[in-house]
């Protein structure tokens, strides 16, 4: 347990062993705009059944679609992709040292789960948790995009805030996005409140992911640091 | 393995109407989705629609949304293309084509494992 209570959810096992690769020899580009700063991005996706499992793809693709925008290696952005329910399962970790084209083709496996419940507070006490519990790369900014489309029982909220503000006190940045009539707009309000950087974007529905996926990823993008340059030797 | 069969294309006048079908048969009970796909000579395969097995929810390419709709009978194994307000450019050959998991993005043709064998479109002006 963690001081203060809270019950430390078991470590999810590696997907798949990891598979080293050059880092320099890097894939090139796939648009003019390419987010190269040093950033730690976690996906977390609703699994209920608020999305349909066609909605639920789109969900994915926009996934894919921001991680073609980003400059993803182990030296600038490391993503991580989390699906939750009533618990969460990890499909990439933010350590895992594999190509982006691959890490792409683990984004678009994710299952659709199709739970009664999607715990908004299961998922932030995992990425407090098991994503951030050690920070081994302080000089990144930290991001946890939140992509909510559901409400959970309010049994389930009731550390939920707690979580939030254990995220604040690591630096994790929390932007939510609420996705279409069912997103839980106090939760969003709640996790805005905590700091100004913890942006929302809220949605009618998954529809208008990919007009405002420029936008999302200009933000998250803005909010970290670029590299600083390679010092010379005297 | 799943075996799918089209039919229903044909030659028809721009502002005309056509509806495809695409019947499963074989391991139809690990289907996930049934989509339909479009390919004119010298290029690779357009997504056009899909249609989830489990929730009957569906997705279109922006080409055709609005005037194209994809519907299924569960009875029948039976997936169906109506496509209203045709156009010269639709002219194409239309494959049917399944998907036993949620792997891959659902409008790249990578992610389905069987396909029909195709049938021909054409809208002439």
């Known amino acids: 347990q963690e001081p203060g209570g809270l019950v430390v959810p078991p470590t999810d096992a590696p997907v798949s062993p990891t598979t080293l690769y050059v880092e320099d020899i890097s894939e090139p580009p796939l648009h003019d705009f390419y987010c190269s700063r040093l950033l730690d991005l976690v996906f977390l996706l609703d699994g209920s059944s608020r999305l349909s499992e066609a909605e639920f793809e789109v969900l994915k693709a926009f996934v894919v679609d921001m991680m073609e925008r980003l400059r993803i290696s182990q030296k600038w952005v490391r993503v991580a992709v989390v699906e939750y329910h009533d618990g969460s399962h990890a499909y990439i970790g933010l350590k895992d040292r594999k190509r982006p084209s691959e890490l792409r083709r683990i984004a678009s496996q994710v299952k659709y789960a199709g739970s009664q419940v999607a715990s908004t507070s299961e998922v932030l006490k995992y990425t407090l948790f098991q994503i951030f519990s050690k920070i081994d790369r302080p000089e990144a900014s930290r991001i946890a995009l939140l992509l909510m489309a559901s409400q959970e029982p309010q049994r389930m909220s009731r550390n939920f805030v707690r979580y939030v503000q254990g995220l604040k006190k690591k630096k994790v940045i929390v932007i939510p996005v609420g996705i279409g009539p069912h997103a839980n707009l106090k939760q969003i309000r709640l996790i805005e409140k905590q700091a100004p950087e913890n942006k929302a974007f809220v949605l009618s529905s998954v529809d208008e992911l990919e007009q405002q996926r420029d936008e999302i990823v200009s933000y998250l993008c803005d909010l970290a640091p670029e590299a600083p340059p390679p010092t010379l030797p005297p | 393995q799943v075996q799918l069969v089209e039919s229903g294309g044909g030659l028809v006048q721009a502002g005309g109407s056509l509806r495809l079908s695409c019947t499963a048969s074989?391991?139809?009970?690990?289907?996930?989705?049934l989509g339909w796909f479009r390919q004119v000579p010298g290029k690779g395969r357009e997504f056009i629609a899909v249609i989830y097995w489990r929730d009957g929810s569906s997705l279109y390419s922006d080409s055709v949304k609005g005037r194209f709709t994809i519907s299924k009978d569960n009875a029948k194994n039976t997936v169906y293309l109506q496509m209203n307000s045709l156009k010269p450019e639709d002219t194409a050959v239309y494959y049917c084509?399944?998907?036993?998991?949620?792997?891959?993005?659902?409008?790249?043709?990578?992610?389905?494992?069987?396909w029909g064998q195709g049938t021909q479109v054409t809208v002439s002006s």
């Open positions: 074989g391991r139809t009970f690990s289907t996930y989705a």
């Open positions: 084509a399944n998907r036993h998991d949620s792997r891959g993005t659902y409008y790249s043709s990578r992610g389905y494992d069987y």
